[in-house]
């Protein structure tokens, strides 16, 4: 014998009170699939998460967070704080990068800057909290005396008319 | 497949005590810091407590320090937070969290593992 359930559809649970008949699920309640026997409650999005996509008889609520915060975790579980750039959040909160790391982003950690010399190159821009040394030429290329070389004129793409 | 189960949430008054164990699966508990971390329903992640894989080295946010205490059973693959003098400020859902490595501190954290959350509300 088939399950009488099995005929409610999303959005209605199979009603025991009323002789298995099927019900629409409640205000602030859903079902996302057929044959449910109770209807979920509805997530509700308050304080320092916000509503991204309402609930409907079928589907939950999904939240995210409020400006200055991110989401973590499944579905957007947590909001962690936002740092500004230069900074990367610890336990205790944001904190400044140390001097010789940088972090360009809002979240994430400090990162060292790039040890040019590791390329055989020099430092052309030195570093910040906020941005990563830019490296340049090797210092070799700079000594008197050093051949200068044209680069090759970069290649264009097939169909575009120089400037 | 790694897992953290929280449990132990619930509505209590203040001035009570709750206790919150995690069940950890699927990695070699004692290997590994792990963390305690509160939402609060206003605003962000706050970090509550850290213990290290041995369970020797522990940390406590300054607002919980004093009332809160950590410590894991690494026979039972159990993180504890004992929750003692709770404030209507600690109403919040309380995450356990694998950190990456074997020691912690109070300062930077490396969450590779969530839990899903156990709430605790406190209220008269």
């Known amino acids: 014998l088939q399950d009488p359930c099995s005929n409610c559809p999303a959005g209605t649970f199979c009603d025991n009170n009323r002789n298995q008949i099927c019900s629409p699920c409640p205000p602030n309640s859903f079902s996302s699939a057929g044959g449910q026997r109770t209807c979920d409650i509805c997530r509700q999005c308050k304080g320092v998460f916000r509503t991204r996509k309402e609930c409907s008889s079928t589907s939950n609520a999904e939240c995210d967070c409020t400006p200055g915060f991110h989401c973590l975790g499944a579905g957007c579980s947590m909001c962690e704080q936002d740092c500004k750039q230069g900074q990367e959040l610890t336990k205790k909160g944001c904190k400044d990068c140390c001097f010789g790391t940088f972090n360009d982003q809002k979240r994430g950690i400090c990162r060292p800057w790039t040890n040019c010399s590791l390329d055989g190159k020099s430092v052309l821009v030195n570093g910040t909290k906020e941005r990563d040394v830019v490296c340049g030429p090797s210092p070799a290329d700079l000594s008197p005396g050093a051949s200068s070389v044209t680069p090759p004129a970069p290649a264009r793409e097939p169909g575009h008319s120089p400037q | 497949e790694v897992q953290l189960l929280e449990s132990g949430g619930g509505l209590v008054q203040p001035g009570g005590s709750l206790r919150l164990s995690c069940a950890a699966s699927?990695?070699?508990?004692?290997?590994?810091?792990m963390s305690w971390f509160r939402q609060p329903p206003e605003t962000g992640l706050q970090w509550v407590s850290s213990?290290?894989?041995?369970?020797?080295?522990?940390y406590y946010a300054d607002s919980v320090k004093g009332r809160f205490t950590i410590s894991r059973d690494n026979s039972k693959n159990t993180l504890y937070l004992q929750m003692n003098s709770l404030r209507a400020e600690d109403t919040a859902v309380y995450y356990c969290?694998?950190?990456?490595?074997?020691?912690?501190?109070?300062?930077?954290?490396?969450?590779?593992?969530w839990g899903q959350g156990t709430t605790v509300t406190v209220s008269s």
């Open positions: 699927g990695f070699t508990f004692s290997s590994y810091a």
């Open positions: 213990i290290g894989g041995s369970g020797g080295d522990t």
């Open positions: 969290a694998k950190e990456g490595s074997n020691g912690t501190d109070d300062n930077y954290y490396d969450v590779d593992v």
